[in-house]
């Protein structure tokens, strides 16, 4: 009985199409597959960012695979050929590993890259990213932001930079069509006449960095002698009601009565006959049904109800913001 052997895939490489971290891993079939013409050869691919403890593992019949990586670090990958047991009289045969690596040659010292990168997707409509210049960089240093997500033909540069002392310190993005629930890749690179500037790469999903507008149209309704219903409306914009969680802060006669988190645009409050004044504010956040994370909105304007008797339904609006 001769031992069945199979070669590893050929021409295994990591290709950077310029998508700021979304890379192609590709290969060619192994040599000498003539003996296994009736067989469907599979490939086991393992890859990770250098420094990561765990490998991602994929088994595929294809000759390519695509995924996102952190280009601030190198990437390593290995692949071998698998012959299923159907082809080899009952035992799976594996080739040796073919290995490859990829990294972007870093320019400049790490301190020159942008600091404190912060991106917020306001009301699921407007993306704004801001950063601080690298440590010790001169005023002749300028940073440029590029972004890509699946659906764009190529990486795009920021349309509207925010500047400070002539330096770009932020970006207001244009309309981003069909850009949520997928990885959003950003590169901020820089140029200076004096020294090379280190690039920075960032990846996130837009739905996870949404900061909604605060709720509006806060009202009170007397439900019974000891119950008051607080109501509000979702803010204008594209976020549907099903995506909101709310936090309410209620003050009764200048003392905090309750803080509550609710899923609907109402909250029923038990009151006493002695209550002279009732005020509440509410803020919103995208909930777990629509995102993995989010940012609380600002508090709404304060809504107060006061008078000798709350049942008189005297409504007073206070238009200063709650702090």
């Amino acid at each position: 009985d001769t031992e069945i052997k199979v070669n590893p895939p050929q021409d295994f490489e990591i290709v950077d199409p310029g998508y700021l971290g979304y890379l192609y891993l590709q290969w060619q079939p192994p040599l000498s597959l003539d003996h296994f013409k009736e067989c469907t050869v599979e490939y086991e691919l393992k890859y990770r960012n250098i420094g990561s403890e765990t490998w991602k593992t994929i088994i595929t019949k294809n000759l390519h695979y695509k995924d996102g990586f952190d280009l601030n670090k190198g990437i390593e990958a290995k692949i071998h050929t698998l012959l299923p047991w159907q082809c080899t009289n009952g035992s799976e045969v594996q080739s040796s590993w073919a290995e490859t690596t990829y990294w972007i040659s870093p320019q400049g010292i790490p301190e020159t890259k942008v600091q404190d990168m912060d991106c917020v997707y306001y009301n699921w409509q407007y993306l704004l990213c801001s950063w601080k210049p690298g440590i010790g960089v001169l005023l002749d240093t300028n940073y440029n932001l590029f972004y890509w997500y699946e659906g764009l033909d190529h990486a795009l540069q920021c349309v509207d930079y925010i500047k400070a002392d002539g330096q770009n310190i932020g970006c207001r993005f244009p309309y981003l069509e069909a850009s949520d629930y997928k990885d959003f890749y950003i590169c901020v690179n820089g140029s200076s006449e004096n020294k090379p500037i280190r690039s920075s790469y960032f990846t996130f999903q837009l739905q996870n960095i949404v900061k909604p507008l605060p709720p509006v149209y806060l009202t009170f309704t007397r439900e019974s002698s000891c119950e008051i219903k607080l109501k509000w409306s979702i803010p204008l914009g594209p976020i549907p009601a099903r995506c909101f969680d709310y936090e309410i802060e209620i003050r009764e006669d200048d003392t905090t009565l309750v803080t509550a988190t609710v899923e609907n645009e109402t909250y029923t409050l038990k009151t006493t006959n002695e209550t002279r004044q009732l005020c509440f504010v509410v803020r919103s956040k995208v909930n777990i049904y629509c995102s993995d994370d989010g940012i609380w909105s600002e508090w709404s304007d304060k809504q107060c109800w006061e008078g000798e008797d709350l049942s008189k339904k005297t409504l007073l609006r206070h238009h200063h913001h709650h702090h």
Epitope: Y122, Q125, Y126, L128, D153, L156, Q157, V159, D160, I162, K163, A164, I169, G170, R172, F173, P174, Y175, L213, E298
Partner: antibody, heavy 119, light 111 residues
Framework: QVQLVQSGAEVKKPGASVKVSCKAS????????MNWVRQAPGQGLEWIGR????????DYNQNFKDRVTITRDTSASTAYMELSSLRSEDTAVYYC????????????WGQGTSVTVSS | EIVLTQSPATLSLSPGERATLSCRAS??????????MNWYQQKPGQAPRLLIY???RQGSGIPDRFSGSGSGTDFTLTISRLEPEDFAVYFC?????????FGGGTKLEIK
Amino acid sequence: QVQLVQSGAEVKKPGASVKVSCKASGYTFSNYLMNWVRQAPGQGLEWIGRIDPYDGDIDYNQNFKDRVTITRDTSASTAYMELSSLRSEDTAVYYCARGYGTAYGVDYWGQGTSVTVSS
Amino acid sequence: EIVLTQSPATLSLSPGERATLSCRASESVDNYGISFMNWYQQKPGQAPRLLIYAASRQGSGIPDRFSGSGSGTDFTLTISRLEPEDFAVYFCQQSKEVPWTFGGGTKLEIK
């Protein structure tokens, strides 16, 4: 909820200056560009300039650059447009108008401030 | 500066009809894969109201009967079925480069 409230009507003599204010509420003032646009009686719209409240960066229409000054007070969420050396052809309604970056147009406008220049 | 020319200057139509307004730029207003062309509606004594931005995207709260199209130098605002409240003046505006400029306007009047 977004509101841009402008200062009241002004009547000025030729050669004088006028300063129009625009108080913003209902949104984060520094996140949006603030534009100034004017409209002479029965005429079209003319862009004067804009300020980025985030960093104070300003772009002016060169037709006005020697006479106009746009400023902002972020703590008061207010933008200002001052026009000097007034002449009769500066008689117009002056609008402040908010826009998120150049790709979004101008989505909220103030109510307008009428400036009349007459001797 | 980029000059915008709107046509016709006046358009007389009846409610229920389709309106097609044109705006031509003296040079392309495209950049970064975006057409920096916006459309506004203005009624007497009121501030303008944003209808369309980036050539074809509807402003917030704008009825579906308003649509925009075009790229480069030629742009169109279409109102599919005119409602009585649609009779007003319409301006195009480019935001590709400073100074931002407006077209001279098209007055849409009741026939």
